[in-house]
């Protein structure tokens, strides 16, 4: 493993065997709203006197409070096996990220290998078209951007319930409208392997020139 083994300075402690978290699943891929469980485990020989509890971290920040984690201890003649279980019910996009376990053993911090949770779902809009007032027969642009995972996300433009582009464009997409003679409603459809999300419809109004 790429984890740091404890390094302690006294002569006796130099004889201690290295301790590291056991290997576990690395990259978990699942759909939004599913449940997920994963764990870290470590074997601590009896020769180690000082150990602290296992803490969970996500993207560099410690997970405190409401997260559902359980630590189980299994002692035997040689030491103790510790398993830290972590579960997330109905995962959301915000659960995406790198999870690590940390533990102090003989005053040395040990860090587990990462568990990367990838939550896949329908495309999510980060930029939708916005309503504008335009001059009659004057070109204007509309922008649509949606993300996964999964990628790629493909965009279709819709004007008054009819698709504008026959072939989809990769997100982000800019639609250049050459000009309008009357009010129209535009929206965009974002497609990925999980399905389709439709943006809000925006009214493009024609400015009345006094």
């Amino acid at each position: 493993a790429h984890t740091a083994a404890p390094q302690v300075t006294s002569t006796a402690s130099k004889l201690l065997p290295p301790v590291a978290f056991n290997h576990t699943i690395g990259h978990i891929v699942l759909s939004e709203h599913k449940n997920v469980k994963f764990n870290c485990s470590i074997n601590i020989p009896n020769t180690y006197q000082e150990t602290a509890g296992i803490s969970w971290w996500k993207d560099g920040k410690e997970l405190l409070g409401a997260h559902h984690s359980i630590t189980q201890f299994y002692p035997d003649e040689e030491g103790v096996s510790i398993i830290a279980l972590f579960s997330i019910a109905s995962v959301q996009r915000s659960d995406n990220g790198s999870y690590f376990c940390k533990m102090k053993v003989n005053n040395r911090e040990i860090v587990s290998d990462p568990i990367y949770v990838e939550v896949q779902g329908l495309p999510y809009f980060i930029k939708q078209p916005e309503s504008v007032n335009v001059t009659r027969n004057t070109a204007f642009n509309l922008t649509c951007q949606a993300v996964g995972p999964p990628e790629p996300v493909n965009i279709f433009w819709v004007q008054n319930s009819s698709r504008v582009n026959e072939k989809p464009e990769r997100s982000p997409s800019v639609l250049t409208v050459p000009g309008l003679t009357e009010t129209a409603v535009f929206s965009c459809e974002a497609h990925n392997d999980k399905g389709l999300t439709v943006s809000k419809g925006v009214h493009i109004n024609i400015k009345v020139i006094p």
């Epitope: 290997h23 990259h27 891929v29 993207d59 860090v111 990462p114 990367y116 951007q145």
Partner: antibody, heavy 122, light 111 residues
Amino acid sequence: QSLEESGGRLVTPGTPLTLTCTVSGIDLSSYALGWVRQAPGKGLEYIGIISSTGTTYYATWAKGRFTISKTSSTTVDLKITGPTTEDTATYFCARGAYAGYVAFGPYYFHIWGPGTLVTISL
Amino acid sequence: DIVMTQTPASVEAAVGGTVTIKCQASQSISNFLAWYQQKPGQPPKVLIYAASHLASGVPSRFKGSGSGTQFTLTISDLECADAATYYCQSYFYSSTSIYNAFGGGTEVVVR
């Protein structure tokens, strides 16, 4: 979303060379961007990566020989400090698979540029 | 550094046949492994990530498996369009660094 490399040309050994990766539709504050090269008729060789936070990581063989830096919101440079004939290759830039403002992540490559050819010769 | 060893260097099979490519990591990388396809004059295209998950638009004829240090890419019902070079890539990382490395590549010839 697209990437395009530029700056590849013929230079003599020891002449520093800077390649630029220009991205379109990609937020470099959310995605990591890596550099990979391929010598003529050879396999892919990972050089290094710059994370969304701006932290750089290099393959051991590449440390000190290459420098990756974000030069704008749409460009990332790869500087070859003292090229030798062994550095003759097509250089690709590629976008990491996942968004997120983090220094570390699972950086396999989802979108690649077409590559730019660098020739180091006397 | 992690070293990825890919075998064989080249393999030939008939249309409709099956090829198997192996990739071995010098140390455990869990399932942080991707497979790419590259055709001459083109950049690589990701086929599989997390050792076994198909990337978008990739036919189910491509199958990845393995964990730890041993990984396999299997291409069944071979088509002429599958003639290409295939690469594995470790994308393992830790809380302090990343360990990216490519295998040496396997040329697939379809006859």
